[in-house]
Amino acid sequence: AFGISGVQKYTRALHDSSITGISPITEYLASLSTYNDQSITFALEDESYEIYVEDLKKDEKKDKVLLSYYESQHPSNESGDGVDGKMLMVTLSPTKDFWLHANNKEHSVELHKCEKPLPDQAFFVLHNMHSNCVSFECKTDPGVFIGVKDNHLALIKVDSSENLCTENILFKLSET
């Protein structure tokens, strides 16, 4: 697990920078857990980071993720509503210079070290589709969400809006 103090220093540093030419509208340091209260954890193994979904022991510290929120204009010709809309996009970074990425070919979620500007694969459209839970939809692949599969994070295709409340794509954010 990553040390929280490093993430807090990183949070301060990020406030002075910008990503993809725009600054986040806000940032939030939080632990990420599933709808069923399993923790999302990050571990360094063989010089690469692995992401796990697991039950933590009683006093075990939860890993924190820096969520950076961006406002994105959605033109009316894409929205189909005849009006321009805004949506929230997030990037998720558990440690300095590493961000969660959507690997659409492998249907996997990976931690990549990257330079700014961040690639589109690092951005997720934020949904709150269920009381106090959020979901993360791939910017690069609409209808595909970060989800839980076999105790790992994976990309899961959601076929219709009725399935957006399916538990395996719902996550909780907590400051504790």
């Epitope: 939030y28 406002e71 509503d81 005849g82 009006v83 805004k86 949506m87 929230l88 934020l126 106090n132």
Partner: antibody, heavy 121, light 107 residues
Framework: QVQLQESGPGLVKPSETLSLTCTVS????????VHWIRQPPGKGLEWLGV???????GYNSALMSRLTISKDSSKSQVSLKLSSVTAADTAVYYC???????????????WGQGTLVTVSS | DIQMTQSPSSVSASVGDRVTITCLAS??????LAWYQQKPGKSPKLLIY???RLADGVPSRFSGSGSGTDFTLTISSLQPEDFATYYC?????????FGQGTKVEIK
């Protein structure tokens, strides 16, 4: 352009069910959440509940046992039903739309004009 | 549920004055706070969202600050059309509770 219009009876008898409809235009209920908010005469705003873009609902905990919010997407309508009403439910009822697609974090830009419902025998 | 406490409940001010309204959340809500202005007989109007973001068409004399539990709405130079009631609302978690309102009156 975006519009929300509340409709329903202006007078409801105590113990009966208050039923209101919000008819929306200029946006899709599959992309934006619609909320109900009320304001008793001379008082502040009270959030009642939401029908989210994904179809799930959220309610004010104090009213949860009496409140139901549902939608008819084909008519672009969101309905509110509040059962067992008393004089304390007399208020202007507003329906409002989320600022952001798929998310309530951005507050509410678009409001209906509100409809006054009086509970009295 | 998260409680939102606004202060003061009313303020008397003159045109040109700087007016500050505060909102205190009973638990941390990140930056997910909105401010609304309401005039008698009218629907509320969104002024500020995400604690600091000015809604479209809102004059720049309005500004928002804060994060976590403490938030402020500032009107830098009060104009005649600003006399109204102002509400904060937390949007971090459902139920999305409002503050009790602050009435800005003419001195």
């Amino acid at each position: 352009q975006v519009q929300l219009q509340e409709s329903g009876p202006g007078l409801v008898k105590p113990s009966e069910t208050l039923s209101l409809t919000c008819t929306v235009s200029g946006f899709s209920l599959s992309k934006y959440g619609v909320h109900w908010i009320r304001q008793p005469p001379g008082k502040g705003l009270e959030w009642l509940g939401v029908l989210r873009a994904g179809g799930s609902t959220g309610y004010n905990s104090a009213l949860m046992s009496r409140l139901t919010i549902s939608k008819d997407s084909s008519k672009s309508q969101v309905s509110l039903k509040l059962s067992s009403v008393t004089a304390a439910d007399t208020a202007v009822y507003y329906c409002v739309r989320d600022h952001y697609y798929y998310s309530s974090y951005g507050g509410f830009v678009y409001w209906g004009q509100g409809t006054l419902v009086t509970v009295s025998s | 549920d998260i409680q939102m406490t606004q202060s003061p409940s009313s303020v008397s001010a003159s045109v040109g004055d700087r007016v500050t309204i505060t909102c205190l959340a009973s638990q941390t809500i990140g930056a997910w706070l909105a401010w609304y202005q309401q005039k008698p007989g009218k629907s509320p109007k969104l002024l500020i969202y995400a604690a600091t973001r000015l809604a479209d068409g809102v004059p720049s004399r309005f500004s928002g600050s804060g994060s976590g539990t403490d938030f402020t709405l500032t009107i830098s130079s009060l104009q005649p059309e600003d006399f109204a009631t102002y509400y904060c609302q937390q949007l971090d978690s459902s139920p999305y509770t409002f503050g009790q309102g602050t009435k800005v009156e003419i001195k």
